[in-house]
């Protein structure tokens, strides 16, 4: 007869491991007992369990409640056992020693491999600001056994670097994603992808990029200077900019306070029916946590009685 087993049994942490040991005997041969032991190199055999044809299953105190025979029906030549709720410390070499009649004793070894799936974590880097050089956008760390693979999935252009730390029974892998921040990256997903043989599918953690910036400011509303004449209603100036975080707007008049009746509504400056009092230099001040910008315009309110038109100056300043 001969023993049938596996060279390697692979199981995911927390699952049950079936340790196979089947005696393929000749007709009339019987198995008296099967002794299972852990036999890691440099250490003596440690009892796991004993399956006896008469006495039944004996489980070592160290494995009490964790070793069982497979559910019935059971073949009397089958010395396989189930190791419940495999933990990392169970990884190692196991031996089944089968005592048969009349053929004598046989033994076989197998290696139990316990896969420890990673629980990845993604840590964003420092705040990203337009104008910075190469900057850490995010780092992703995953620890498992064997070492997991950590990659990035994104449309954003950048560079990656990885490092790993070996522990006694696992390895931690950290991958960093660096980029040169630009406003076009705002709202773009950056996804850490972790692969591991203990995972049914890759684990993905997505981080949305936020790049702080503030665009140049400009003022719209003076495109047709002839519309700015005494008595015109609904005249308005609109300050144009964009930023992350979204900016706030403030209007002032350079050559004095805002005239009465002029309404400030965020980025818009609304005028009552125009008079010559509304002529002046108006400044739009745009700011966010990242930066601030100014844009100023000169408003000349035309008197229709006068033949000659007035010049309108648009000046943009930062």
């Amino acid at each position: 007869g001969e023993l049938e087993t596996s060279d390697v049994v692979t199981v995911v942490l927390g699952q049950d491991a079936k340790l196979p040991c089947f005696y393929r005997g000749d007709s009339g041969e019987q198995v008296g007992q099967v002794a299972w032991a852990r036999v890691d190199a440099g250490e003596g055999a440690q009892e796991l369990a004993l399956l006896h044809s008469k006495y039944g299953l004996h489980v070592s105190p160290a494995y009490e409640g964790r070793v069982e025979q497979p559910p019935p029906p059971r073949n009397p030549l089958d010395g396989s056992v189930l190791l419940r709720n495999a933990v990392q410390a169970d990884e190692g070499e196991y031996e089944c020693r089968v005592s048969t009649f009349p053929a004598g004793s046989f033994q076989a070894r197998l290696r139990l491999r316990v896969l420890v799936p990673p629980l990845p974590s993604l840590n964003p880097g420092p705040a990203l600001e337009e104008g910075q050089g190469l900057t850490l956008a995010a780092s992703c760390t995953a620890e498992g056994s064997p070492a997991p693979s950590v990659t990035w999935d994104t449309e954003v252009k950048g560079t990656t670097s990885s490092r790993s730390f070996k522990h006694s029974r696992s390895a931690a892998v950290t991958s960093e994603f660096h980029l040169v921040p630009s406003r076009s990256m705002n709202g773009q997903p950056l996804t850490c992808v972790v692969s591991h043989p203990g995972l049914l599918q890759d684990q993905r953690i997505t981080h949305i990029l936020h790049v702080s910036f503030l665009a140049e400011a400009s003022v719209r509303g003076l495109e047709d200077q002839n519309l700015w004449h005494i008595g015109r209603e609904g005249a308005m100036l609109k300050c144009l900019s964009e930023g992350q975080p979204p900016p706030s707007y403030n209007w002032t008049r350079l050559d004095g306070p805002l005239p009465s009746g002029v309404r400030v509504d965020g980025d818009t400056l609304g005028f009552p029916p125009l008079t010559t009092e509304h002529s002046g230099i108006y400044v739009c001040h745009v700011s966010n946590e990242f930066s601030s910008r100014d844009s100023q315009v000169t408003v000349d309110v035309l008197d229709p009685q006068e033949d000659s038109g007035k010049q309108v100056d648009l000046v943009s300043a930062s």
Epitope: A35, A37, L50, H52, Y55, L57, H58, P61
Partner: antibody, heavy 123, light 107 residues
Framework: EVQLVESGGGLVQPGGSLRLSCAAS????????MSWVRQAPGKGLEWVSG????????YYADSVKGRFTISRDNSKNTLYLQMNSLRAEDTAVYYC????????????????WGQGTLVTVSS | DIQMTQSPSSLSASVGDRVTITCRAS??????LAWYQQKPGKAPKLLIY???SLQSGVPSRFSGSGSGTDFTLTISSLQPEDFATYYC?????????FGQGTKVEIK
């Protein structure tokens, strides 16, 4: 024919010592683990101590730990129990018994027993 | 330690009666259970090992059953030489422990 014969029992004062012997014959002595089991007058059976076939592994009941020592001389096919600091509650008939090693520290039931030797601890 | 609880502690029966003695272990012991018979002034004698296997030379009227925690010794037809004290013993763990015994007396 398997035979186990105990000797060495007797009357001893509390605090005294006694050495029991069990001579085995009729089988391969080293193939079997051996035990001492006692029975106080009118009481049930109580396992006292056990030893593996090689003598490497020894086991004791909590009630005798630190006072009794089990040993064996495989060249003489003899099992021993050295009893020190004896107490009145150690008074009993002491039996030796054999059990076959299955594997590790797992043994069969004790299939052969000696006739017993009486130990009386009294002042 | 594993506790072995035997019942009854004593019973009276007549020759030819069917006698049943039970033994319960405080935790599972598979079939690592033996039954012994002891007569006054004599050493215990192994009757049943591995819960249900008859020791060589023991009459077939003795039988054992059970596994795990609950075990039974049955004497199918009590004979005059069967009046004795019966003990169960577990040898699943060290220390091996005995039940307190069941004394079978003549009614």
């Amino acid at each position: 024919e398997v035979q186990l014969v105990e000797s060495g029992g007797g009357l001893v004062q509390p605090g005294g010592s006694l050495r029991l012997s069990c001579a085995a014959s009729g089988y391969n002595f080293t193939d079997y683990g051996m035990s001492w089991v006692r029975q106080a007058p009118g009481k049930g059976l109580e396992w006292v101590s056990g030893i593996s076939g090689s003598g490497d592994n020894k086991y004791y009941a909590d009630s005798v730990k630190g006072r009794f020592t089990i040993s064996r001389d495989n060249s003489k096919n003899t099992l021993y129990l050295q009893m020190n600091s004896l107490r009145a509650e150690d008074t009993a008939v002491y039996y030796c018994a054999r059990a076959e090693l299955l594997a590790f520290d797992v043994y069969t039931a004790s299939d052969y027993w000696g006739q017993g030797t009486l130990v009386t601890v009294s002042s | 330690d594993i506790q072995m609880t035997q019942s009854p502690s004593s019973l009276s029966a007549s020759v030819g009666d069917r006698v049943t003695i039970t033994c319960r272990a405080s935790q599972g012991i598979s079939s690592y259970l033996a039954w012994y018979q002891q007569k006054p002034g004599k050493a215990p004698k192994l009757l049943i090992y591995a819960a249900s296997s008859l020791q060589s030379g023991v009459p077939s009227r003795f039988s054992g059953s059970g596994s795990g925690t609950d075990f039974t010794l049955t004497i199918s037809s009590l004979q005059p030489e069967d009046f004795a004290t019966y003990y169960c013993q577990q040898h699943y763990t060290t220390p091996p422990t005995f039940g307190q015994g069941t004394k079978v007396e003549i009614k």
